[in-house]
């Protein structure tokens, strides 16, 4: 299973649920579905309040039980380490795959943290991060921001991923804007 890691804003906007959590248990395999579940302890929720309704405490995250079908394998054994998890809700359960955005909270830049807590949501409605995978790239709409990180040092470590968000400048126009300048 291979996929290009998304821009964090894309991960935020395309997810039903975005939380901060610790992985606290050994994974278990459910025999009925052949999904594995990880026990988590949620510390913050950034997106999904309406989708979850009253059941706002997520205790498990589910993923396919095999790598070849995009199952997520959690490699850290540090149960006190917090992770940003962006996933989909299926039948009220949080699902992630290899392609989901799952990252140690401490590995995120201050700008990315700001994005997840406040700013990315502003760009979800109108704006689209448009990946440029090979040159030449053309903007297909004024609401697209051209994401060129992959052409340089790798998508997650690039400047646009770590410091910028695609936000509305005026109706019908979105541009890259610095998240650093918005940090108090």
């Amino acid at each position: 299973c291979t996929c290009v890691p998304p821009h964090p804003q894309t991960a935020f906007c395309n997810s039903d649920l975005v939380i901060r959590a610790k992985f606290v248990g050994t994974p278990e395999v459910n025999q009925t579905t052949l999904y594995q579940r990880y026990e988590i302890k949620m510390t913050k929720m950034y997106k999904g309040f309406q989708a979850l309704g009253d059941a706002a405490d997520i205790r498990f995250v589910y993923t396919p039980a095999m790598e070849s079908v995009c199952g997520y394998f959690h490699r850290s054994h540090n149960r006190s380490e917090e992770f940003l998890i962006a996933g989909k809700l299926q039948d009220g359960l949080l699902h992630i795959t290899t392609c989901s955005f799952v990252a140690p909270w401490n590995s995120l830049s201050l700008a990315q943290r700001r994005g997840f807590t406040k700013t990315y949501t502003v760009g979800c409605e109108e704006c689209t991060v448009f990946p440029c995978l090979s040159i030449p790239c053309k903007l297909q709409s004024g609401t697209h921001c051209l994401w060129t990180d992959q052409l340089l040092q790798g998508s997650e470590k690039g400047f646009q991923s770590r410091h910028l968000a695609c936000l509305p400048r005026e109706p019908g126009l979105c541009t890259w804007q610095s998240l650093r300048s918005q940090i108090a």
Partner: antibody, heavy 113, light 111 residues
Framework: QVQLVESGGGLVQPGGSLRLSCAAS????????MSWVRQAPGKGLEWVSV????????YYADSVKGRFTISRDNSKNTLYLQMNSLRAEDTAVYYC??????WGQGTLVTVSS | DIALTQPASVSGSPGQSITISCTGT?????????VSWYQQHPGKAPKLMIY???NRPSGVSNRFSGSKSGNTASLTISGLQAEDEADYYC??????????FGGGTKLTVLG
């Protein structure tokens, strides 16, 4: 008590097909993932395939992917393994197993011309 | 393609204790608590002796015990008896290949 009984083994020519069945009793069949495991003569155990309890997910060993198909009929408490494009190296005793615990007695599949 | 490493053979005298090791990786033995041990007598189906690392199914003698440390699981048989002579296989859930087995260990009871 819990029981698994395999059937359908036999002699088949290379390139041929065979369908194995496994009749289950003594447990709630649709609550358990089921596997096929094989053992070539004088060799160790090799996992072949698994199917989830509800039949929605199936996984295969690389050695059989694209040739074998696992399926189940929960209304009949029966597990199946459809084996196509059989090769000499598929010769083995095939065991039906409840995920990680109960095994059947096995059925011998011989692929030879 | 053997994924888990077991010694090819071990031996012991009646009454002794023996231990069979099973070494894997963090994606199988080390990452999950799904390690099983099977006993297989010639011409018979494998019989589950230990599941979930250290649990014994009902009907299995308490002379059989299992444990795990890191990426290595172990089966210990105490008070060895003649009927313990058999092949022993470890098995683990594996994230990459779903299910993997060791190559098997032939246990010989001397005398």
């Amino acid at each position: 008590q819990v029981q698994l009984v395999e059937s359908g083994g036999g002699l088949v020519q290379p390139g041929g097909s065979l369908r194995l069945s496994c009749a289950a009793s003594g447990f709630t069949f649709n609550s358990y993932a089921m596997s096929w495991v094989r053992q070539a003569p004088g060799k160790g155990l090799e996992w072949v395939s698994v199917i989830s309890g509800n039949g929605s997910n199936t996984y295969y060993a690389d050695s059989v992917k694209g040739r074998f198909t696992i399926s189940r009929d929960n209304s009949k408490n029966t597990l199946y393994l459809q084996m196509n494009s059989l090769r000499a190296e598929d010769t083995a005793v095939y065991y039906c197993a409840r995920f990680l615990d109960i095994w059947g007695q096995g059925t011998l599949v011989t692929v030879s011309s | 393609d053997i994924a888990l490493t077991q010694p090819a053979s071990v031996s012991g005298s009646p009454g002794q204790s023996i231990t069979i090791s099973c070494t894997g990786t963090s994606s199988d033995v080390g990452g999950y608590n799904y390690v099983s041990w099977y006993q297989q007598h010639p011409g018979k189906a494998p019989k589950l002796m230990i599941y979930d690392v250290s649990n014994r199914p009902s009907g299995v003698s308490n002379r059989f015990s299992g444990s795990k440390s890191g990426n290595t699981a172990s089966l210990t048989i105490s008070g060895l008896q003649a009927e313990d002579e058999a092949d022993y296989y470890c098995q683990s859930y594996d994230f990459i290949r779903f299910m993997v087995f060791g190559g098997g260990t032939k246990l010989t009871v001397l005398g």
